[in-house]
């Protein structure tokens, strides 16, 4: 796979093998993956993408799930890179807080928060 | 500060309080913090609330501007007890599934991707 | 590297409102480490600061022309834009758009508004 | 609101050094920025918290910043350095950014 596509695609194109693939994915019973309890799905990839490992261990590879995986671990590498972007530029203190009020007010309207 | 302040509520409080202080935590001339370069801010918890505890120990403390410093302190625990719910529950594979989907789902439909 | 292009009439009637586009190209505008600015400069003359941008649209402006204008960003299509309107010959100038970062890093190559019936 | 005042034209001959300076009330708290610009041309920063260098930027280019006075050094100055020079700082009281009037530099000969 070109690691060239764009990952807007790369996501469209795993959300359709993950539909292609669920019944030979589900096919161990016993298997156990720890699900996030709450929605605020970015501050959880790290366990999702442990759980995505623990999954593709167990599955038998070949075909188009093998390309599951494969889009899957560059997703994995975009987020990474997207991580390693969250310190890079030292800014004065007033761009800061400009960031800072837009992530509070991210969380005011968007966040799904339980008290 | 009771901590039983519902966090939407501590939220809302901190932005205004925010703005209330801004002049005074802006006063440092030559101090500079990491700033995201991208607006998916939950991957960013981690060094924003670096970027805070930066600014605290730079800014003279006393009346208000001790409580914009505490509420943030406690939207980071709120934060922090919302990142251990992320590995809390383990699940048959097609939860994990489940939740794999709709991850991937708000990543394309809601994520600013810049490929 | 970034890249800035201005784009907007160059002739504007006096008590109209100047309207200028900034097209930001070899990075996204909604990158958190920069506010996006208007800068002008009157023939002869130094830099005056028209005023900047964060990308959730927070704007700060030059007291001194406050009340006559408007930036805004559309992040969609990675622009951001100047409005100053009730324009005299004295706005006639060079009009920059920029990226600031803890100091003006890109720059447009400027573009010559005149204002003249 | 904050005001920096700089003086209208320097002039040099080719190898000596020019100072330009920028005055402004405590300056030596703020950050200081230097732009150069050429006629026609959009500016470009050639000296930015008051005494570090960009890449690209000769050497001869240097800064300083104390008390009421940021001064731009151009040391051994050639013809190519004829230009104008701006300096810049962030008013914090109202995060608002500020130019100097401008300095025309003249390489004489």
């Known amino acids: 796979i070109p690691t060239e596509i764009p990952t807007s695609a790369l996501v469209k194109e795993t959300l359709a093998l993950l539909s292609t693939h669920r019944t030979l994915l589900i096919a161990n019973e016993t298997l156990r993956i720890p699900v996030p309890v709450h929605k605020n799905h970015q501050l959880c990839t790290e366990e999702i993408f442990q759980g995505i490992g623990t999954l593709e261990s167990q599955t038998v590879q070949g075909g188009t799930v093998e390309r599951l995986f494969k889009n899957l671990s560059l997703i994995k590498k975009y987020i990474d890179g997207q991580k390693k972007k969250c310190g890079e530029e030292r800014r004065r203190v007033n761009q800061f807080l400009d960031y800072l009020q837009e992530f509070l007010g991210v969380m005011n309207t968007e966040w799904i928060i339980e008290s | 500060i009771p901590t039983e302040i519902p966090t939407s509520a501590l939220v809302k409080e901190t932005l205004a309080l925010l703005s209330t202080h801004r002049t005074l935590l802006i006063a440092n001339e030559t101090l500079r913090i990491p700033v995201p370069v991208h607006k998916n801010h939950q991957l960013c918890t981690e060094e924003i609330f670096q970027g805070i505890g930066t600014l605290e120990s730079q800014t003279v403390q006393g009346g208000t501007v001790e409580r914009l410093f505490k509420n943030l302190s406690l939207i980071k625990k709120y934060i922090d007890g919302q990142k251990k719910k992320c590995g809390e529950e383990r699940r048959r594979v097609n939860q994990f599934l489940d939740y794999l989907q709709e991850f991937l789902g708000v990543m394309n439909t809601e994520w600013i991707i810049e490929s | 590297q970034v890249q800035l292009q201005e784009s907007g009439p160059g002739l504007v009637k006096p008590s109209q409102t100047l309207s200028l586009t900034c097209t930001v190209s070899?990075?996204?505008?909604?990158?958190?480490?920069?506010?996006w600015s208007w800068i002008r400069q009157h023939p002869g003359k130094g830099l005056e600061w028209i005023g900047y941008?964060?990308?959730?649209?927070?704007?700060y402006y030059n007291p001194s022309l406050k009340s006559r204008v408007t930036i805004s960003v559309d992040t969609s299509k990675n622009q951001f834009s100047l409005k100053l309107s009730s324009v005299t010959a004295a706005d006639t100038a060079v009009y920059y758009c920029?990226?600031?970062?803890?100091?003006?890093?890109?720059w447009g190559q400027g573009t010559l508004v005149t204002v003249s019936s | 609101s904050y005001v920096l005042t700089q003086p209208p034209s320097v002039s040099v001959a080719p190898g000596q050094t020019a100072r330009i300076t920028c005055g402004g009330n405590?300056?030596?708290?703020?950050?200081v920025y230097w732009y150069q610009q050429k006629p026609g041309q959009a500016p470009v920063l050639v000296v930015h918290?008051?005494?570090d260098r960009p890449s690209g930027i000769p050497e001869r280019f240097s800064g300083s910043n104390s008390g009421n006075t940021a001064t731009l050094t151009i040391s051994r100055v050639e013809v190519g350095d004829e230009a104008d020079y701006s300096c810049?700082?962030?008013?914090?009281?109202?995060?608002?950014?500020?130019f100097g009037g401008g300095t025309k530099l003249t390489v004489l000969g």
């Open positions: 920029a990226s600031l970062g803890n100091w003006f890093d890109y």
């Open positions: 070899g990075g996204s505008i909604s990158n958190g480490g920069y506010y």
């Open positions: 941008i964060y990308y959730s649209g927070s704007t």
């Open positions: 405590n300056i030596g708290s703020k950050s």
């Open positions: 918290d008051d005494s």
């Open positions: 810049q700082v962030w008013d914090s009281s109202s995060d608002h950014v500020v």
